[in-house]
């Protein structure tokens, strides 16, 4: 069980997770081509944007994070991949504290992108209310930025 005292450790951990090259991959029958990955990213983008905007409106007192954008593309593969396994535990962790319906839809999409046989780390959210809100905001900001990055990479090929 990983515990965090605030968003800085979370951001550092997630950044490291994103940069870790993936050694395993899905079973062939479940591996998706770039076209399908793009479809899933297109589904995720409005969900992620909406969740972030709603949270920012609801939690106006929480400072916006200006952390470095996540390097969420696997640098050794073409096309680039979203490291779903590194992101999923965070959405599972914040699910009880945010919009469950939207979070469930995001988790459903991320599950489709998940590499099989990859263990998911269990994440605990900070106990402090303010730190918890900042933790959630950071996740949502980093994830939105990550999706934009993946989508741009998928679109920059010979389309």
């Amino acid at each position: 069980m990983l515990s965090h005292t605030g968003p800085s450790r979370f951001a550092l951990f997630l950044l490291c997770s994103m940069e870790t090259l993936l050694s395993s991959h899905m079973a062939p029958t479940h591996q998706l081509p770039p076209s399908d990955v793009r479809k899933i990213i297109l589904e995720l983008q409005p969900l992620s944007r909406g969740l972030l905007e709603d949270y920012q409106k609801k939690e106006t007192g929480v400072p916006e994070s200006n952390r470095t954008l996540l390097l969420c593309l696997t640098s050794d593969s073409q096309p680039p991949r979203l490291n779903s396994s590194a992101i999923l535990p965070y959405f599972r962790a914040i699910r009880p504290l945010s919009d469950k319906n939207i979070i469930d839809k995001i988790i459903e999409q991320l599950d489709k992108l998940k590499f099989q046989h990859e263990p998911e780390t269990e994440i605990s959210v900070p106990a402090d209310t303010f730190e918890c809100k900042s933790f959630i905001l950071t996740i949502l900001q980093q994830f939105s930025a990550c999706l934009e990055s993946v989508f741009k990479s998928l679109n920059s090929g010979p389309q």
Partner: antibody, heavy 118, light 111 residues
């Protein structure tokens, strides 16, 4: 059994808009991806775009400025609108389902022939 | 866009013989051992019908005389033995990358 049926005008004037309907039975358009494809007189097939189960759309870049795909979930129908048509848009238009990731378009409509002419 | 080149454009085969249709993609359509290449049959006046998905998987209800093979950029559809009912145009299609693209078609006739 999944069935798709295309309908719409068979003749459209150059510069006008083409609007086609795909009526789906045997499946809900709130699952899967729902596509438009056309076949030109020379038999060339062109993929045009889709609307997803959630209403997200994506189009072939070659048509992006002219194409809109929309839907009416209460009628289980989806639509193709193509603006500023020319004689080059004369084709047979098909709707088709893409049901599962990593699969293929498994159900197609019978097609509707559209001629662009003044 | 990935360009799909089919050959031959037309093919005349005797009943009971083997028909072989080739499709070449301008770049690989493979991901982790799966080839996102599909084959369709279109009979005159009908809509395309899925025969083979992911290069070699026979769609449900399609006779076993239809077969698909290949990987990377080169793919083959085989019909053996050819029957009178197989007169149609056959298309390959890639779903690896957007936009999806089709081959130009191969018209199969009976000799």
């Amino acid at each position: 059994e999944v069935q798709l049926v295309e309908s719409g005008p068979s003749l459209v004037k150059p510069g006008g808009s083409l609007r086609l309907t795909c009526s789906v039975t045997g499946d809900s358009i709130t699952s899967g991806y729902w596509n438009w494809i056309r076949k030109f007189p020379g038999n060339k097939l062109e993929y045009m775009g889709y609307i997803s189960y959630s209403g997200i759309t994506d189009y072939n870049p070659s048509l992006k400025s002219r194409i809109t795909i929309s839907r009416d979930t209460s009628k289980n129908q989806y639509y193709l609108q193509l603006n500023s048509v020319t004689t080059e848009d004369t084709a047979t238009y098909y709707c088709a389902r893409y049901g599962n990731y990593g699969y293929a378009m498994d159900y197609w409509g019978q097609g509707t022939s559209v001629t662009v002419s003044s | 866009d990935i360009v799909m080149t089919q050959s031959p454009a037309s093919l005349s085969v005797s009943l009971g013989q083997r028909a072989t249709i080739s499709c070449r993609a301008s770049e690989s359509v493979d991901t982790y051992g799966n080839s996102f290449m599909h084959w369709y049959q279109q009979k005159p006046g009908q809509s395309p019908k899925l025969l083979i998905y992911r290069a070699s998987n026979l769609e449900s209800g399609i006779p076993a005389r239809f077969g698909g093979s290949g990987s990377g950029t080169d793919f083959t559809l085989t019909i053996d033995p050819v029957q009178a009912d197989d007169v149609a145009t056959y298309y390959c299609q890639q779903s690896y990358e957007d936009p999806w693209t089709f081959g130009g078609g191969t018209k199969l006739e009976i000799k």
